[in-house]
Interface confidence: medium
Amino acid sequence: QLLEPCGYIYPEFPVVQRGSNFTAICVLKEACLQHYYVNASYIVWKTNHAAVPREQVTVINRTTSSVTFTDVVLPSVQLTCNILSFGQIEQNVYGVTMLSGFPPDKPTNLTCIVNEGKNMLCQWDPGRETYLETNYTLKSEWATEKFPDCQSKHGTSCMVSYMPTYYVNIEVWVEAENALGKVSSESINFDPVDKVKPTPPYNLSVTNSEELSSILKLSWVSSGLGGLLDLKSDIQYRTKDASTWIQVPLEDTMSPRTSFTVQDLKPFTEYVFRIRSIKDSGKGYWSDWSEEASGTTYEDRPSRPPSFWYKTNPSHGQEYRSVRLIWKALPLSEANGKILDYEVILTQSKSVSQTYTVTGTELTVNLTNDRYVASLAARNKVGKSAAAVLTIPSPHVTAAYSVVNLKAFPKDNLLWVEWTPPPKPVSKYILEWCVLSENAPCVEDWQQEDATVNRTHLRGRLLESKCYQITVTPVFATGPGGSESLKAYLKQAAPARGPTVRTKKVGKNEAVLAWDQIPVDDQNGFIRNYSISYRTSVGKEMVVHVDSSHTEYTLSSLSSDTLYMVRMAAYTDEGGKDGPEFTFTTPKFAQGEIE
């Protein structure tokens, strides 16, 4: 049989509000007192196996002892009542678990949602943590009928067990209860139809229009409780490579619909669309977004002509010259479709013209030494661009008017070029550039800028520590103006090698040093200056600085009959590099001098 305990602790299931005081009592049975020769003064209270200080304990009478705890904060404490039997052996009488926490707060922010095809889900904010087992019950009723309670598993939401009935108002509230109290939220009263979150629209399709290259037509299927609800839509779109969505104005999609035409789009551009829906009154919740669907607008004729330029090769026996017409492929945003070919028309006079259809981006033609007009248009399947027109003057005409104050400078990892326009109205500017090298020809790239531009950056893939020769040519209605050129670096570095110094002439007390300019491929920047370091085997090193325009320098005040070691360094804006060391010996006597 089970042994009877020697006494009891009251209360047997203590739950205390945190921060408050709490008193427990231990009552010993009479039989226990006699058996163990003890009374209440022999009681030892313990919390989590640690003795409670005597000052918290009060002996009420020979059978009863109390213990008081102030400002209880621990969530759970094992409280035991023990006796010292026969005055020395500690024996457990009884134990309880003391819990602490808070009564439930009044639940707030109660909201309900009816996900289409599912039961109603309500959510709330339970307030502060109670640290106690707390039951939350979602209650709901009509004016005349109660619905089954919904016992929350999580304490913050509950899905009811019954299907919602639309177009009848329902009252909903939450009750929260634990050992320290019971409280109800404010109730909310609503028609479940106003809390619907529709399933996303589906079968979204996108079609283009041959008539209009700026539109795409969307169609989709909406659910809306199987047609019970009228839904309005929210349509967003972006270009295929963009990350941000463009919003179709909501006022354009307010009426219930299953199709829409999106306007003001760019031709021959792939767009991605998504759509969501909500009850047309705006009550309830937006559906999740539909699966994305994409479509491409129809082609339109190219919106502008290509950049157009020419290069003249040496003339053939002075009778005619070979001219290479060059142009740039249009970017997609201006091509408005797949460029099929280019139409080039060359006119010598009103009566003599020749038309070429070219698939590439250059055409070489032979022209006499007369003035010609070349026009260029790009063609896609819809039509041709406007024509770019270039006047190719006679080679006997001297180009007048150039840009002035031409400058180039690196900024933000780009190479910028700026200039002051010539005094005569310009049609456009041509910028040409290439890497200067002694090992390879200067392979030119080029770009065209509008007449209004006088500052731009080079749009090719430029390399660091390479010297670029940049040429700017204004183009007038009558033909190209004069060209202005300069050199520039995207980013300078220290030279790849220093100068190799040699002696040009050596005297008793002076020496003329000479060196060659560092090849442009090794300069890595603008050579700003040189330093010449020279010393004897025992003497102090001397350094002189020489301007970069020099290729020789005279060392003076040298000692006769002495070995000198010389080294030169070249400096760009980014640092210097030493050349090889060179030695020479001054003669003992000057020329014509004898011992």
Partner: nanobody, 125 residues
Framework: QVQLQESGGGSVQAGGSLRLSCVIS????????MGWFRQVVGKEREGVAA????????VYADSVKGRFTISQDSSKDTVYLEMNGLKLEDTGMYYC??????????????????WGQGTQVTVSS
């Protein structure tokens, strides 16, 4: 490579007719003019007629205007010279030529880069 092959030459009585043909092949670069030239022994080669392959405009030397007609077929790889009312002074070696120069001087021989071997035309009394 570019080749021009003339045919149709021969001997004919004064006042008679001949039709010369010239087939051009291997031309990757579009020609602008096709021309007929003739050379009499001891004299410089002179322009007779030329046709623009782009617009079909025709130019004739004053000495053959109204008697000779230059034409091309639809595929533009053959050019013809129809010669009527032939005179003794029309005798000579007739050459077909192709030019890539855009010009109004279409019977200037210096502007033609490609030449055929020639076909002999002899007019007798």
């Amino acid at each position: 490579q570019v080749q021009l092959q003339e045919s149709g030459g021969g001997s004919v009585q004064a006042g008679g007719s001949l039709r010369l043909s010239c087939v051009i092949s291997g031309f990757t670069y579009r020609q602008t003019f096709m021309g007929w030239f003739r050379q009499v022994v001891g004299k410089e080669r002179e322009g007779v007629a030329a046709i623009s392959t782009g617009g079909g405009s025709m130019v004739y030397a004053d000495s053959v205007k109204g008697r000779f007609t230059i034409s091309q077929d639809s595929s533009k790889d053959t050019v013809y010279l129809e010669m009527n009312g032939l005179k003794l002074e029309d005798t000579g070696m007739y050459y077909c030529a192709a030019s890539t120069v855009i010009t109004s001087e279409s019977i200037n021989r210096n502007l033609y880069q490609y030449w055929g071997q020639g076909t002999q035309v002899t007019v007798s009394s």
